[in-house]
Interface confidence: low
């Protein structure tokens, strides 16, 4: 089938200790190859300190994943998720505390 | 070669103010992020400011936010420093360096000779 | 803030030796951990990132461990080349922070 791009959402909870966890997903998006990783100051955080969800089928043909990582409360700034799917790629903020979640479309 | 080259130090009056320079060449500047680091005649290493790779996001050290002010020119290959209402303690050599990227994760891989700041009466 | 309890702040040893160096971190900064050489008149230069990795052109004797909050930077048979002052860097939380450095002499 033709490409379809992934729709990324990145929200933030509450952890511990000063800390939050930041998830981002990726959702809607065909073929199922695709790259989902956190970023602190621009450069991709080791495995060991993300955790990923499979990417599984979501009904409609197309995919879905996520990856999520724990920061502290004040960092977020220097956090992204970066998606590259299909030879396009983006960046994603971590939204600020009043705000729950942001996602966007990319062609 | 990665070449980091300061410039603009020098001897300035307490209050007053300089801009410290920093070409880049030997690498893609716009991928990396930047940081100044500056070390007091005791030798001790200070962080001062950090600027994102596009620009977005600046970082200072309490000792100088409101006072100094990070900023790069993306199409130069240029890393700036603007520095005012100095103080003695202020005095040092200052280092431009490149943040490692992928291949040195929160590291400062490169770093000019540096450029020294006197500020005194 | 994260402070960065480094030491000894000096020591000299014998051309040959195995010399360590401390860093220990006021809070968790999993592997966010950088070692730098400055050769008295030079700069800094960097040895170790992410706490147990050699930088490019860095010889194998050099070597880097820990993760959370303690740290050691290794020089196994140690050389005249050495003598130099060593210093850790945070770089897991704004402010980045440094220790104030280990200065190696030879006996």
């Known amino acids: 089938g033709s490409t379809v791009p992934p729709m990324v959402n990145v929200t933030r909870s509450e952890a511990s200790e000063g800390n939050i966890t930041v998830t981002c997903r990726a959702s809607s998006f065909y073929p199922r190859n695709i790259i989902l990783t956190w970023r602190q100051d621009g450069v991709s955080l080791s495995h060991d300190t993300q955790q990923w969800g499979d990417v599984l089928p979501d009904g409609n043909g197309t995919y879905q994943t996520w990856v999520a990582t724990r920061i502290c409360r004040g960092e977020e700034q220097r956090f992204t998720c970066y998606m590259e799917h299909s030879g396009n790629h983006s960046t994603h903020p971590v939204p600020s505390g009043n705000s729950h979640h942001h996602h966007h479309h990319h062609h | 070669e990665v070449q980091l080259v300061e410039s603009g130090g020098g001897l300035v009056k307490p209050g007053g103010s300089l801009k410290l320079s920093c070409a880049a060449s030997?690498?893609?500047?716009?991928?990396?992020?930047m940081y100044w680091v500056r070390q007091t005649p005791e030798k001790r290493l200070e962080w001062v400011a950090t600027i994102s790779d596009g620009i977005t996001y600046t970082y200072y050290s309490d000792s100088v936010r409101g006072r100094f002010t990070i900023s790069r020119d993306n199409a130069e290959n240029t890393l700036y420093l603007q520095m005012s209402s100095l103080k003695s303690e202020d005095t040092a050599m200052y280092y431009c360096s490149k943040g490692g990227g992928s291949t040195a994760r929160g590291a400062l891989d490169f770093w000019g000779q540096g450029t020294s700041v006197t500020v005194s009466s | 803030d994260i402070q960065m309890n480094q030491s000894p702040s000096s020591l000299s040893a014998s051309l040959g030796d195995t010399i360590t160096i401390t860093c220990h971190a006021s809070?968790?900064?999993?592997?966010?951990l950088s070692w730098y050489q400055q050769k008295p008149g030079n700069i800094p230069k960097l040895l170790i990132y992410g706490a147990s990795h050699l930088h490019t052109g860095v010889p194998s004797r050099f070597s880097g461990r820990g993760s959370g909050t303690g740290f050691t930077l290794t020089i196994s048979s140690l050389q005249p080349e050495d003598i130099a002052t060593y210093y850790c860097l945070q770089g897991q939380s704004y402010p980045l922070t440094f220790g104030s450095g280990t200065k190696v002499e030879i006996k």
């Open positions: 030997g690498f893609t500047f716009s991928d990396y992020y």
């Open positions: 809070q968790n900064i999993h592997v966010w």
